[in-house]
């Protein structure tokens, strides 16, 4: 049964469809294939830490290394990326944190994504001294494996050198890559010798070999691209938003929600409020009014702006944010003080995440 | 291993009630929707609506306001649908499906018949 | 009610070809729609989310673009195990809506 009752007609149902937003990422954790993770569960007073991993539960293996309030990944592969939570249970409540872990090299083979520094890769000789080819900057070739989420953009690059300058082709899996052999298609920028492909799909998995060949010789350098794919899930609050704040009578407050949803959010604002001077129903849930809702005629719903307030104002509210997947919540209290107080943004409370989990 | 078990078939008396269980395993039960959906030979796959096991919220079709009522259970983790005042229309397959319809439970055969 | 409508209820086609079955929303859905694959006696099978991403485990022959209105489910080369019913979703809005179905038959 729900867990409130409403007052004014109002619904927490989407009763229009949900505007689009620009979405807030959670706190991301980047390792490198191989490597060692170590991330603190960021919870106070946690009588009881409990893990999960895209939404099932985490228990410690032989890779897993759970103590107290922290998660140990040991040897880290592509497939430890995803959405993790930590859950601290209290005797009267419990909280949740949640952060990403993404297994993955840097977008570029060791090289920012615009190619601003590429010229200096393109070496030019002394006509007289001959030479077969040589790589010219072996650091951004280091890293061999690049695993990346589906949909993103990879660059691989063999900067070479040479006289007659080099040329430079790509092999996948062995055989020569052609266009048609992926949706899209590729990129060779020969003056920064990279291969790029926009939007990677889990077929673009494999073995990316560049040969670079004049007449007096050929190396070869060999990358292996691994594309890790997503499952949907539900909205992600940024922790500590809503912020806890406090203003004047008659001042004005603006709450703040930053939500991460591959899926299309519908936001709300909620406050507990009275009815009949009751705080709650008949059935002893607590009454709720939605005061703000993502829809057609809402502008920026992960923002409720207050203004004018009174002491009627003074109290929790909720940002409840829900997809098809699922939903979570966190609140903030208003204090409205007297006109002779001065306000202050309560940046020593912090709000207590109220996830519905 | 995600698993989403439906109870079996029912054959029931038009004018009557029934109650379909879902029971989830292998995931984080609070943490996800159960959607129901309806499928007929003639009109397809039909949203039912959806609860939200951690706190009770749920989301109809309107079309199945009157007609369905979902409820879950976090203790045994199962979600359950009850269908009331049957009909041969309400004769179809009924399906729950975790929040990202990624996992779908067998399916339940409702008959309504006389 | 956001409507979505599979054009063609049948498609015919061989194993090595590639098929494009489309779907049209109603109104603007964004890349809020999902494909689902059916065969007899089995539950819908997860394919593609939220217009383009490929569930996790389904092979990579299935892809899946649009945005908006307009949505194309491809298979880039069948195989006779990918006869069956085939459906667009669109999770943009309650009623979630599917399609009519699309079913994949050998010639």
């Known amino acids: 049964r729900p867990s409130f009752s409403l007052v004014e007609d109002t619904t927490l149902e989407p009763e229009e469809p949900p505007t689009k937003y620009q979405i807030s990422q959670p706190e991301v954790y980047v390792a490198a294939p191989g490597e060692s993770l170590e991330v603190r569960c960021l919870l106070k007073d946690a009588a009881v830490i409990s893990w999960t991993k895209d939404g099932v539960h985490l228990g410690p293996n032989n890779r897993t290394v759970l103590i107290g309030e922290y998660l140990q990944i040991k040897g880290a592969t592509p497939r430890d990326s995803g959405l993790y939570a930590c859950t601290a249970s209290r005797t009267v409540d419990s909280e949740t944190w949640y952060f990403m872990v993404n297994v993955t090299d840097a977008i570029s083979s060791g090289d920012d994504e615009d190619d601003t520094d590429g010229a200096e890769d393109f070496v030019s000789e002394n006509s007289n001294n001959k030479r077969a080819p040589y790589w010219t900057n072996t650091e951004k070739m280091e890293k061999r494996l690049h695993a990346v989420p589906a949909a993103n953009t990879v660059k691989f690059r063999c900067p070479a050198g040479g006289n007659p300058m080099p040329t430079m082709r790509w092999l996948k899996n062995g055989k020569e890559f052609k266009q048609e052999h992926r949706i899209g298609g590729y990129k060779v920028r020969n003056q920064h010798w990279s291969l790029i492909m926009e939007s990677v799909v889990p077929s673009d998995k494999g073995n990316y070999t560049c040969v670079v060949e004049n007449e007096y010789g050929s190396i070869n350098h060999t990358y292996h691209l691994d594309v890790v794919e997503r499952s949907p899930h539900r909205p992600i609050l940024q922790a500590g938003l809503p912020a806890n704040a406090s203003t004047v009578v008659g001042g004005d407050v603006e709450f703040v929600c930053k939500v991460y949803s591959d899926a299309q959010p519908h936001i709300q604002w909620i406050k507990h409020v009275e009815k009949n001077g009751s705080k709650y129903g008949p059935d002893g849930l607590p009454y709720l009014k939605v005061l703000k809702h993502s829809g057609i005629n809402s502008s920026n719903a992960e923002v409720l702006a207050l203004f004018n307030v009174t002491e009627a104002d003074a109290g929790e509210y909720i940002c409840k944010v829900s997809n098809y997947i699922g939903q979570a919540n966190q609140s903030a209290w208003l204090t409205v003080l007297p006109k002779q107080q001065a306000p202050g943004r309560e940046k020593e409370i912090t709000a207590s995440p109220d996830y519905l989990e | 291993e995600v698993q989403l078990q439906q109870s079996g078939a029912e054959l029931v008396k038009p004018g009557a009630s029934v109650k379909m269980s879902c029971k989830a395993s292998?995931?984080?039960?609070?943490?996800?929707?159960v959607h129901w959906v309806r499928q007929t030979p003639g009109q397809g796959l039909e949203w039912i609506g959806l609860i939200y096991p951690d706190n009770g919220d749920t989301s109809y079709n309107q079309k199945f306001k009157a007609k369905a009522t979902l409820t879950a259970d976090k203790s045994s983790s199962a979600a359950y649908m009850q269908l009331s005042s049957l009909t041969s229309e309400d004769s179809a397959v009924y399906y729950c499906a975790r929040g990202g319809f990624d996992y779908w439970g067998q399916g339940t055969s409702l008959t309504v018949s006389s | 009610d956001i409507v979505m409508t599979q054009s063609h209820k049948f498609m015919s086609t061989s194993v090595g070809d590639r098929v494009n079955i489309t779907c049209k929303a109603s109104?603007?859905?964004?890349?809020?729609v999902a494909w689902y694959q059916q065969k007899p006696g089995q539950s819908p099978k997860l394919l593609i989310y939220?217009?383009?991403y490929r569930y996790s485990g389904v092979p990579d022959r299935f892809t899946g673009s649009g945005s908006g209105t307009d949505f194309t489910f491809t298979i880039s080369s069948v195989q006779a195990e990918d006869l069956a019913v085939y459906y667009c979703q669109q999770h943009y809005s309650t009623p979630y809506t599917f399609g009519g179905g699309t079913k994949l038959e050998m010639k």
């Open positions: 939220s217009a383009s």
């Open positions: 292998g995931y984080t039960f609070s943490f996800y929707n």
């Open positions: 109104q603007d859905v964004s890349t809020a």
